[in-house]
């Protein structure tokens, strides 16, 4: 990896052992200023593999609310507006980082956690398994 | 929101002001034990709106490597295997949290940051804008 010289103005880290504990400023910086969030807001309905969005809430997690996509159909919508089972709707999943309160119910202490979320759905050609 | 009783075993938080600084344990807990990550690994190629994955690396960010999807075509792949512009390939985007080293190059001090990433692509019916 790239070795970066340490900034002499860094805060001291007491705990040098692994698991590593770091300081995190929760005042979120949003890098998405140039993007229009409305742009993709209706894709879930216009897609040939449409999906519904389900709210997943967990007060012990940060962010506490995550939206989970569930494909509406097993097949994809064809040109006639019918569900075509020659194609498959599948969820596109992504691993994301969240903060889990640890110990539980603590406002200022967290542990990093990886979770898998479904972001939307796409239409794929099915893999045909032939029986010998 | 839900009010949670504070755990008496929580670490003390010195900084009560906003921006709030919290302690985070970077020993990642992976909740994805029941899922097979290989499952969706070839969707990018089998989709009617296929995509390429581009590596985005930033040593000042945690995680330092993020994979960004870019749709291969503006149209979608039809049954004949041609790119059909009567339908549109679009990226499915998701806002995710990352940690940004702050001050720069510090190993133990971060700020939470929201970034928008494209996870994959889906095929949508285009909105036809008629000129008056």
């Amino acid at each position: 990896g790239i070795t970066i010289p340490r900034n002499p103005g860094c805060p001291n880290s007491e705990d040098k052992n692994f698991p590593r504990t770091v300081m995190v400023n929760l005042n979120i910086h949003n890098r998405n200023t140039n993007t229009n969030p409305k742009r993709s807001s209706d894709y879930y309905n216009r897609s040939t593999s449409p999906w519904n969005l389900h709210r997943n809430e967990d007060p012990e997690r940060y962010p506490s609310v995550i939206w989970e996509a569930k494909c509406r159909h097993l097949g994809c919508i064809n040109a006639d507006g019918n569900v075509d089972y020659h194609m498959n709707s599948v969820p596109i999943q992504q691993e994301i980082l969240v903060l889990r309160r640890e110990p539980p119910h603590c406002p200022n202490s967290f542990r990093l956690e990886k979770i898998l979320v479904s972001v939307g759905c796409t239409c794929v050609t099915p893999i045909v398994h032939h029986v010998a | 929101g839900i009010t949670i009783p504070r755990n008496p075993g929580c670490p003390n938080s010195e900084d009560k002001n906003f921006p709030r600084t919290v302690m985070v344990n970077l020993n990642i807990h992976n909740r994805n034990t029941n899922t097979n990550p290989k499952r969706s690994s070839d969707y990018y190629n089998r989709s009617t709106s296929p995509w390429n994955l581009h590596r985005n690396e930033d040593p000042e960010r945690y995680p330092s490597v993020i994979w960004e999807a870019k749709c291969r075509h503006l149209g979608c792949i039809n049954a004949d295997g041609n790119v059909d512009y009567h339908m549109n390939s679009v990226p499915i985007q998701q806002e995710i949290l990352v940690l940004r080293r702050e001050p720069p190059h510090c190993p133990n001090s971060f700020r939470l940051e929201k970034i928008l990433v494209s996870v994959g692509c889906t095929c949508v019916t285009p909105i036809v804008h008629h000129v008056a």
Partner: antibody
């Protein structure tokens, strides 16, 4: 350096077929798409067809029945075949590289002149 | 098919002048992904076209900053802030949002 060069016959008889080759260098056909565009003498530009980096194609539907496009990645060549030529197919034929993700034609060949005449 | 109407057909200018070329589309060129695939090319006499501007306002590599592109709905404009001798030729707008990809009929930039 990116380079595209068209090669083919100067003269084709009406009702015959035309085959043109675009030989590229400085980039791979597995990474970039290639378009064919033509320009009749003293006129504007007409887009014909594109073969994308993944081998998929998109045709101008007005000409699709007479056109076919293919490529050989290992030889860095793209092939255009046009059937049932008419005198109004007389034009300069260009191949051009697709600007990946921007869908513009960023580099063009010098063109090859095709005259349809008996 | 999308019709791109360019005006003027001919634009006589003096060197150092500003030049402005218009391209009007018969339909919106905004793709579902939010991008507008309208490009500008210059074809000098006896040469193949060269890409100047892609996606409305992005200058292609090596293109001088005197060239700029803008849009207002379905009206697109190419501006040359100070015309130089090497800028003379025929300018084409082109769209790749819809198939078939189409070109405008061209605007000939010439010396007054």
């Amino acid at each position: 350096e990116v380079h595209l060069k068209e090669s083919g016959p100067d003269l084709v008889a009406p009702s015959q077929s035309l085959s043109i080759t675009c030989t590229v260098s400085g980039f791979s056909l597995t990474t970039y798409g290639v378009h064919w565009v033509r320009q009749p003498p003293g006129k504007g530009l007409e887009w014909l067809v594109v073969i994308w980096s993944d081998g998929l194609t998109t045709y101008n539907s007005a000409l699709k029945s007479r056109l076919s496009i293919s490529k050989d990645n290992s030889k860095s060549q793209v092939f255009l075949k046009m059937n049932s030529l008419r005198t109004d197919d007389t034009a300069m034929y260009y191949c051009a590289r697709d600007y990946t993700y921007e869908y513009a034609m960023d580099y063009w060949g010098q063109g090859t002149t095709v005259t349809v005449s008996s | 098919d999308i019709l791109l109407t360019q005006s003027p057909l001919s634009l006589p200018v003096s060197l150092g002048d500003q030049a402005s070329i218009s391209c009007r589309s018969s339909q919106s060129l905004v793709h579902s992904n939010g991008n507008t695939y309208l490009h500008w090319y210059l074809q000098k006499p006896g040469q193949s076209p060269k890409l100047l501007i892609y996606k409305v306002s992005n200058r292609f590599s090596g293109v001088p900053d005197r060239f700029s592109g803008s849009e207002s709905g379905t009206d697109f404009t190419l501006k040359i802030s100070r015309v130089e001798a090497e800028d003379l030729g025929v300018y084409f707008c082109s769209q790749s949002t819809h198939v078939p990809f189409t070109f405008g009929s061209g605007t000939k930039l010439e010396i007054k």
